[in-house]
């Protein structure tokens, strides 16, 4: 159980106040984290409060301004990047968001040694992606879907690709579906460790169907946004990987990396690229039916100036119970011999664990084991492997950092974070300097977040980087809700839940219950993290109980739970929310006439299906930007979990699992449907179809659209959205305004 500190003295209680919706919308109680921008084993950069870029040397204790805020301000820079030789800094301004990760910007290069901006051969604008080489100060950038190279910032550019074309051919950057569902980055190019080679992906979207929607703007006529977007079963992008020698780029030009034969025989994806050395690269490929992944290690052949990927260096990862990997197929972390690697995948018991692969996957040596999961490998050094897991005290929603000594035999394991600030910190991530000489720990909760700096050899804490003192002080007179994380055991399924309780919670009273659901495959909602958000307000001020439940399909509790939803989305996720609600009612403090459910995106889909389940449990509910039919969503995501919408595959369940098919069942609930009209991700089409089905069934419902807003409903729309949803819930629960 995680209880926020309760304050029971009456004298104190009088001075304390509940959270307000305004607090949440203004971000009054937001926290800060500190991630050092490492530039060596013992140095990092950080942007100071007054916007100077400051270099800190941990060993000397010295710090100095490397770039003045005057320079940042002169071009309205919102971001920066130091070249590895420390001669130059790129300054990023005119940020213009595209999709989740992608944006364009204007880039200026500042010469640190000469104290002035680089003139001559300036960068074009806007640029889609720009990065320094790992050594020196070469620049690679993408402009109008083509890749360019500069040996030095002031040099003329060398054009690497020429076929780039908007919405057709993408070089060095992903198309929509690869960005959102496969790479989770804005870039698709990778420098080799010493900057000798540059690898890049080319995505051909020529044959992909286009989603078109209106962007209303301020003009007399709306404009149409067109995005090549493969929905389930549609034609996919065609991907090719090339590598170019950046020292002599014109000599042989880009060389294509061959695709493994077993992958190339049918539709496939490229999933990631990892450089091992300057002359060895590792590519990961995935069949369109995403239960077979191939890791291919390729070597540079000097004589032919080509890349060779021998079959003996192909490693196959296959799932017989679900899809390959978790949300994504994990990436390898290579050891110093430059051929063996560490990787997370399912063990024989169906738990994701670290394995060491020296020759074949079959002979992999399991490094971690147990009925818990290894989540991320942070760093492998000569003698240590740092990773995170949810092993400690068997709470799946925690994250601790562990160190395994791989230099000694047998390897010994140490939890670096488990006992540091045990009550305050149970959910960590880490950021390591070169050779793991030092590292920063960022604790996200359940207490107020704190970031600390540590010695990589001894794990000793060196200093606190950010402890959110102002937040701590601001919260002193706030009546925060209580939070508890517990589990329900139902029919051999463990359902972990987080309950957020009003500050003066009394088990003998009855409270309205709001279920907040996401529930997507490989997601996790029940986490030991700090948050002061909308649901905190609903508990603190409006006296609601809020519950989050991780049901079947969610992550980090083994493959049985994770893959339970394989090919059957929309069934067990909903069942488990309903089961949990019934258990909560049995606890005795829930008013069963006042139960609501809400969710966003996948959560909007689940909340809609739960409302239409015919159980009579829910009085009302909200779906924000829901998926309504899996035929409307992206191929890469949907097919991973559902297969193809074809007769000989899984069309039947595609049809059975739509929200529209259950339109009649909304008759006895109050339903609020919300969507942004410019949602590039879950298209407005989804809500349009729900609305049409409800109208055709003559079912009353409420709806709100947000013109020109995407899947995030940001800016002023956020305020409007939460105000609107609050009114809806208060009305549903008969709470006075």
């Amino acid at each position: 159980i995680v209880l926020r500190p309760s304050r029971v003295h009456n004298s104190e209680e009088n001075t304390m106040r509940a959270l307000t919706l305004k607090d949440i919308l203004n971000g009054t109680f937001s926290y800060k984290t500190f991630f050092p921008n490492w530039i060596s084993g013992q140095e990092y950069l950080h942007q100071s409060a007054d916007n100077n870029i400051v270099l800190y040397n941990i060993e000397t204790g010295q710090s100095y301004t490397i770039l003045s805020n005057r320079t940042m301000k002169s071009v309205n820079a919102s971001n920066y990047g130091l070249s590895p030789d420390r001669q130059f800094v790129y300054l990023e301004s005119d940020y213009s968001k595209l999709w989740r990760y992608s944006y364009t910007a204007t880039y200026y290069i500042y010469d640190l040694s000469n104290g002035e901006f680089v003139r001559g051969n300036e960068l074009p604008r806007p640029i889609q992606y720009l990065c320094w080489s790992p050594v020196g100060s070469k620049l690679a950038y993408v402009y109008q879907n083509n890749i360019y190279l500069k040996q030095r910032p002031g040099d003329p550019p060398f054009q690497i690709t020429f076929n780039g074309r908007e919405n057709k051919i993408f070089n060095g950057i992903p198309d929509w579906v690869y960005e959102e569902e496969m790479l989770a980055t804005k870039y698709a190019l990778w420098w080799s460790p010493n900057g000798k080679f540059l690898a890049y992906a080319e995505f051909n979207d020529t044959d992909i169907p286009v989603i078109a929607y209106s962007y209303y703007g301020d003009e007399q006529y709306p404009r149409t946004i067109n995005i090549p977007y493969p929905k389930a079963g549609a034609k996919n992008p065609v991907v090719r990987i090339f590598i170019i020698d950046t020292t002599y780029p014109a000599y042989v030009g880009p060389q294509e990396v061959p695709v493994p034969a077993m992958i190339a025989s049918s539709d496939y994806y490229f999933s990631w690229l990892t450089w091992v050395t300057d002359e060895r690269v590792c590519l990961q490929w995935l069949k369109r039916v995403q239960n077979v992944s191939v890791l291919s290690i390729c070597d540079f052949r000097e004589d032919w100036q080509t890349w060779d990927c021998p079959k003996t260096q192909e490693h196959i990862e296959e799932s017989r119970t679900g899809w390959a990997g978790g949300f994504f197929v994990s990436t390898p972390v290579f050891s110093y011999d430059a051929i063996s690697y560490y990787k997370i995948f399912s063990d024989k018991d169906g738990y994701k664990h670290i394995h060491y692969i020296k020759d074949t996957v079959e002979n992999a040596i399991q490094i971690t084991s147990g009925k818990w999961e290894a989540i991320n490998i942070f760093r492998v050094t000569q003698d240590s492997l740092f990773y995170s897991s949810n092993e400690f005290e068997e709470y799946p929603g925690r994250r601790n950092i562990y160190r395994i000594s791989i230099g000694s035999y047998p390897p010994s394991k140490k939890c670096v974070t488990c006992h540091l600030r045990k009550e305050r910190c149970q959910y960590y991530t880490a950021s390591f300097s070169d050779y793991a000489k030092y590292y920063a720990l960022v604790c996200y909760g359940p207490g107020i977040p704190i970031s600390t700096l540590h010695d990589g050899r001894t794990d000793q804490e060196i200093k606190i980087l950010e402890e959110n003192k102002e937040l701590e002080n601001a919260l002193k007179n706030i009546q925060l809700p209580k939070e508890e994380i517990k589990k329900l055991e139902v029919d051999e399924i463990t359902l972990w839940y987080k309950m957020i309780l009003p500050p003066q919670f009394d088990r003998s009273k009855k409270y309205p219950l709001l279920i907040q659901v996401y529930g997507g495959p490989c997601s996790q909602s029940v986490r030991s993290v700090f948050a002061v958000n909308w649901i905190s307000y609903l508990a603190s001020k409006e006296g609601m109980v809020i519950a989050l439940v991780d049901g079947r399909g969610t992550a980090f509790q083994g493959d049985k739970l994770l893959y339970a939803v394989y090919r059957k989305l929309g069934v067990y996720e909903v069942e488990d929310q309903i089961t949990a609600v019934r258990k909560f009612i049995e606890m005795g403090f829930i008013d069963e006439k006042r139960i609501a459910i809400w969710g966003w995106s996948y959560g909007g889909y689940v909340s809609s299906l739960a409302l239409a389940s015919g159980t009579g449990l829910f009085k009302c509910g909200i779906a924000v930007a829901p998926v309504s039919s899996w035929e409307y969503y992206a191929s890469v995501y949907t097919e991973r979990f559902m297969g193809l919408p074809t007769k000989d595959d899984n069309l039947e369940h595609y049809k059975n699992s739509t929200v529209m098919a259950r339109a009649e069942y909304f008759r006895n609930v109050d339903y609020l449907l919300i969507h942004g009209t410019a949602d590039d991700n879950v298209h407005f089409q989804n809500s349009a179809q729900i609305a049409k089905a409800l109208v055709n069934a003559q079912v009353d419902f409420q709806a709100m659209w947000y013109s020109d807003q995407n899947h995030g409903l940001s800016g002023l729309s956020t305020n409007h959205l939460y105000t609107h949803m609050t009114h809806f819930l208060k009305q549903c629960f008969s709470l006075s305004d």
């Epitope: 301004t65 770039l67 640190l112 040694s113 002035e116 003139r119």
Partner: antibody, heavy 124, light 113 residues
Framework: QVQLVQSGAEVKKPGASVKVSCKTS????????IHWVRQAPGQRLEWIGG????????NYNQKFKGRVTITVDTSASTAYMELSSLRSEDTAVYYC?????????????????WGQGTLVTVSS | DIVMTQSPDSLAVSLGERATINCKSS????????????LAWYQQKPGQPPKLLIF???TRESGVPDRFSGSGFGTDFTLTISSLQAEDVAVYYC?????????FGQGTKVEIK
């Protein structure tokens, strides 16, 4: 009045190194980069390299890379230029000069004040 | 590297007469963003360091007599001494500070005829 005062003349043997200092005064040291320029007898002025005292980062002319090291001691408002593996062609007067840091994108400044020069003679 | 070429190499002018020195750069020194030319002129007298006369091709450094003027843009520049004085006997150098490495012209020696 701004001053850049250089160390005295040096006579060095081929293969040796020379380190010339440039002590500055009466201005804010970290607001100007320091550059080193040499002038061999009857030759044009030749830029060797420079350094930004604000961050200690040097920049060298490729011609001298590997042989020259430019450093600063901000506490003493002094810049240093060390040239190694000396040869007879390195016989020249070596000047330090200051150049205002251009914080703005539209700026860019010439070298407005120079040291008096240091004669370095390389002879066996 | 940008190559700077001065002409003539030497120049003899009578006192009170106009002296004109040309400087040509191998690439443009005009910066499109601010429409400024990154070119400076220096005067060097025997046994002395160079002294800045003109920057941005045509702006006089403070304290420099107004008989010294600079003109030109792009790749072609001129330093003019409108009325030569005895104290103007020196070597004059043009220098580009558009990009690195900084480069100088070979110098023009101005003498009295």
């Amino acid at each position: 009045q701004v001053q850049l005062v250089q160390s005295g003349a040096e006579v060095k043997k081929p293969g040796a190194s020379v380190k010339v200092s440039c002590k500055t005064s009466r201005y804010t040291f970290t607001e100007y980069t320091i550059h080193w320029v040499r002038q061999a007898p009857g030759q044009r002025l030749e830029w060797i390299g420079g350094i930004n005292p604000e961050n200690g980062i040097p920049n060298y002319n490729q011609k001298f890379k590997g042989r020259v090291t430019i450093t600063v001691d901000t506490s003493a408002s002094t810049a240093y230029m060390e040239l190694s593996s000396l040869r007879s062609e390195d016989t020249a007067v070596y000047y330090c000069a200051r150049r205002r840091i251009a914080y703005g994108y539209d700026e860019g400044h010439a070298m407005d004040y120079w040291g008096q020069g240091t004669l370095v003679t390389v002879s066996s | 590297d940008i190559v700077m070429t001065q002409s003539p190499d030497s120049l003899a002018v009578s006192l009170g007469e106009r002296a004109t020195i040309n400087c040509k750069s191998s690439q443009s020194l005009l910066y499109s963003r601010n429409q400024k030319n990154y070119l400076a002129w220096y005067q060097q007298k025997p046994g002395q360091p160079p002294k800045l006369l003109i920057f941005w091709a045509s702006t006089r450094e403070s304290g420099v007599p107004d008989r010294f003027s600079g003109s030109g843009f792009g790749t072609d520049f001129t330093l003019t001494i409108s009325s030569l004085q005895a104290e103007d006997v020196a070597v004059y150098y043009c220098q580009q500070y558009f990009s690195y490495p900084l480069t100088f012209g070979q110098g023009t020696k101005v003498e009295i005829k």
